[in-house]
């Protein structure tokens, strides 16, 4: 034979060839690219697993085949050999031998030839279909266990990505619930801070509120002690009276009484020639009631009536509705003048409300709107404000439009809280809103970071608590 | 725990120069400000200054007549307080302080570092 | 400045004793919410230790035998059963306005 050749195909089957003269032998043999030799390197990201023992079996068994085609291929080398070796020799024979035998030699010789070449064929053919049947069967085989492989694969695939997913989703997972952790433990510490500042807050008024027991007490014993002095007082009034009555008897009882002169506002004061920064007395519209405010005679021309005014801390703006209905503090310092008689003066006429403010750096802003009045106390003094101008910023600090007023013991604000409670003093927040000047008073450099402090937002921002603040109103057309 | 340990203190001659440096540990340095104090040999206890977490605020006693300097490194935790033309009666424990995070009371101290103004 | 007085300088006094310090301010150092006011104790060679902050708040850590009380501009620390350690020098401090100032100090002894 020529040679013996082994290849792959184009579609990846292994090809033994095995030339025998004039005849060719070929054996395809399926291999697939999934399906490797223990002998070849192979490295997957699939699961590894036993190969089926049937398929190692036909392995096995394909290969004794081959030893065997390999076998008969060498015993028919040597047949052929020992043929033209025979051949030789006979033909030698024969022409030594007569002429006239020479044909019936040949002819014999080549039925011989042919006999035994017939039956080597019929033994090659043998093989062969024994082979071809052997690799139909692997090839059945190994087609199904590819399949089953392959749906595996595509398994492990899937449940790899799916696992991929949910490894992301749980690390997406732990990064929130760390953020979440530590958005917690800011919480926590600002709620700790804030608990620490009411604990503070509420030793605090407990000690107040000891210290007004016993002034209670003291003014109960002074109220029972004047009584008794007003008694005594009065029954001498009555005697002199009756003195008076009998003695002065022929004498003009009608008395000429001066003329009480009142003002409504500081703008009135300043009009009746009192130029000087003071305390005033005031008369309610339409009313004798008086009140006493401090009037700003000298700030942007003079004629302001101060309604509120804070700058040291001495006065506790955490106060009742009522308190803040009828004022509280000192006109000469902290004080608020009182919400009924603001709104009845707003009422009866345009005015414009200015806020003067100072920071803790020695830095002075104000806000002043064009319009101002507050609703009756039926509309809980609902703040009314338009034009805004001023250098404490371009937005009004006072929630627009207004909302209604609201104390520790009158909540009328948006939220579901009690922003007065909370953010202490009465004011007219929303929910809670961007001010409160009648926050807690806090001191230099204790100022910032407080939530319930004296704040104007679009000034300083939300935590600052500032240092001073005056709001004052004047007749539009002063 | 909270840790202010002061360093650089010593023996300077009046005119001279000195600068005390503050280690901090225990705690995020740069959110808080940070004070100094001095306390006199027998005397009582005299605040010098302070400093907030940016640098961007220093507040002085007036009595340093600007002869101190307050500065701070918040990348290596440090506080520190350059003294100038040092006098006698500069003679001091340098203490540097932490005050509280809402309201001015000292809570963390150092151990303080001795200077001795002296010819 | 706000100038803080303390009374008395010194003070001489047994273990079990009830002793009182008072602190004297200028200007006033309270609002309606708080005082101003803070204590410590120092002992020789030891830098100083927050005793009350606030006038009255107790630092974490302290015995309950000192309390501070007042408002205003008069404040007092208060050891109820003076003890062995708490022999030492005591300061007011106030925190109402910049400079930050300090008592000179009240000195207890041992009788």
């Known amino acids: 034979y020529n040679n013996f050749r082994k290849s792959m195909d184009s579609i990846g089957k292994k090809q033994y060839q095995v030339q025998h003269g004039s005849c060719s032998y070929t054996f395809l043999l399926p291999e697939m690219d999934n399906c490797r030799s223990s002998s070849s390197p192979y490295v997957s990201n699939a699961v590894q697993r036993d190969a089926p023992l049937e398929y190692d079996d036909s392995v096995q068994r394909l290969q004794v085949l081959e030893n065997i085609m390999e076998n008969n291929t060498q015993w028919l080398m040597k047949l052929e050999n020992y043929i033209q070796d025979n051949m030789k020799k006979e033909m030698v024979e024969i022409q030594q031998n007569a002429v006239q035998n020479q044909t019936a030699v040949m002819i014999e010789i080549g039925t011989n030839l042919l006999n035994q070449t017939a039956e080597q064929t019929r033994k090659l053919t043998d093989v062969e279909a024994q082979v071809l049947n052997q690799t139909t069967r692997l090839e059945l085989q190994l087609l199904e266990h590819s399949l089953s492989t392959n749906k595996l694969e595509k398994q492990i695939l899937d449940q790899t990505s799916e696992i991929n997913k949910l490894q992301d989703k749980n690390s997406f997972l732990e990064k929130k619930v760390l953020a979440m952790e530590d958005k917690h433990i800011i919480q926590l510490q600002s709620i700790k801070e804030e608990k620490d500042q009411l604990q503070v807050l509420v030793s605090k008024q407990n000690s107040i509120i000891e210290e007004l027991e016993k002034k209670i007490v003291t003014a109960t014993v002074n109220n029972s002690v004047l009584q008794k002095q007003q008694h005594d007082l009065m029954e001498t009034v009555n005697n002199l009276l009756t003195m008076m009555s009998t003695s002065n008897s022929a004498k003009d009882p009608t008395v000429a009484k001066e003329e009480q002169i009142s003002f409504r506002d500081c703008a009135e004061v300043f009009k009746s020639g009192h130029t000087t920064n003071g305390i005033y007395t005031l008369t309610f519209p339409n009313s004798t009631e008086e009140i006493k405010a401090y009037c700003d005679m000298e700030a942007g021309g003079g004629g302001w009536t101060i309604i509120q005014r804070r700058e040291d801390g001495s006065v506790d703006f955490q106060r009742t509705w009522k308190e803040y209905k009828v004022g509280f503090g000192n006109p000469s310092g902290e004080y608020w003048l009182g919400n009924e008689f603001v709104s009845q003066l707003t009422n009866q006429q345009r005015y414009v409300l200015k806020i003067h403010l100072k920071d803790w750096e020695g830095n002075e802003a104000y806000s002043l709107y064009e319009h101002f009045y507050l609703s009756s106390e039926e509309l809980n003094y609902r703040i009314h404000l338009k034009g805004l101008t001023g250098t404490a910023g371009k937005i009004s600090s006072i929630s627009q439009p207004g909302n209604d007023f609201s104390t520790k013991d009158g909540d009328n604000d948006k939220c579901i809280c009690k922003c007065s409670q909370m953010l202490t003093g009465g004011w007219w927040f929303d929910a809670c809103g961007p001010s409160n000047l009648n926050g807690m008073y806090y001191p230099q450099r204790q100022n910032t970071n407080k939530f319930n402090g004296i704040k104007w937002y679009y000034w300083k921002g939300s935590g600052y608590s500032l240092k001073a603040t005056t709001m004052m109103i004047r007749p539009a057309d002063f | 725990e909270v840790q202010l340990v002061e360093s650089g203190g010593g023996l300077v001659q009046p005119g001279g120069s000195l600068r005390l440096s503050c280690a901090a540990s225990?705690?995020?340095?740069?959110?808080?400000?940070m004070s100094w104090v001095r306390q006199a040999p027998g005397k009582g206890l005299e605040w010098l200054g302070e400093?907030?977490?940016?640098?961007?605020?220093?507040n002085y006693a007036p009595s340093l007549k600007g002869r101190f300097t307050i500065s701070r490194d918040n990348a290596k935790n440090s506080l520190y307080l350059q003294m100038n033309s040092l006098r006698a009666e500069d003679t001091a424990v340098y203490y540097c302080a932490r005050p509280g995070d809402d309201f001015i009371y000292f809570d963390s101290w150092g151990q303080g570092t001795l200077v001795t103004v002296s010819s | 400045d706000i100038q803080l007085t303390q009374s008395p300088s010194f003070l001489s006094a047994s273990v079990g004793d009830r002793v009182t310090i008072t602190c004297r301010a200028s200007k006033r150092v309270s609002t309606s919410g708080h005082s101003y006011m803070h204590w410590y104790q120092q002992k020789p060679g030891k830098a100083p230790k927050l005793l009350i902050f606030l006038a009255s708040n107790l630092e974490s850590g302290v015995p309950s035998r000192f309390s501070g009380s007042g408002s205003g501009t008069e404040f007092t620390l208060t050891i109820s059963s003076l003890q062995p350690e708490d022999f030492a020098t005591y300061y007011c401090?106030?925190?109402?306005?910049?400079?930050?100032?300090f008592g000179q100090g009240t000195k207890v002894e041992i009788k």
């Open positions: 401090q106030h925190s109402w306005e910049l400079p930050w100032t």
């Open positions: 400093i907030n977490p940016e640098s961007t605020t220093i």
């Open positions: 225990g705690f995020d340095f740069s959110r808080h400000w």
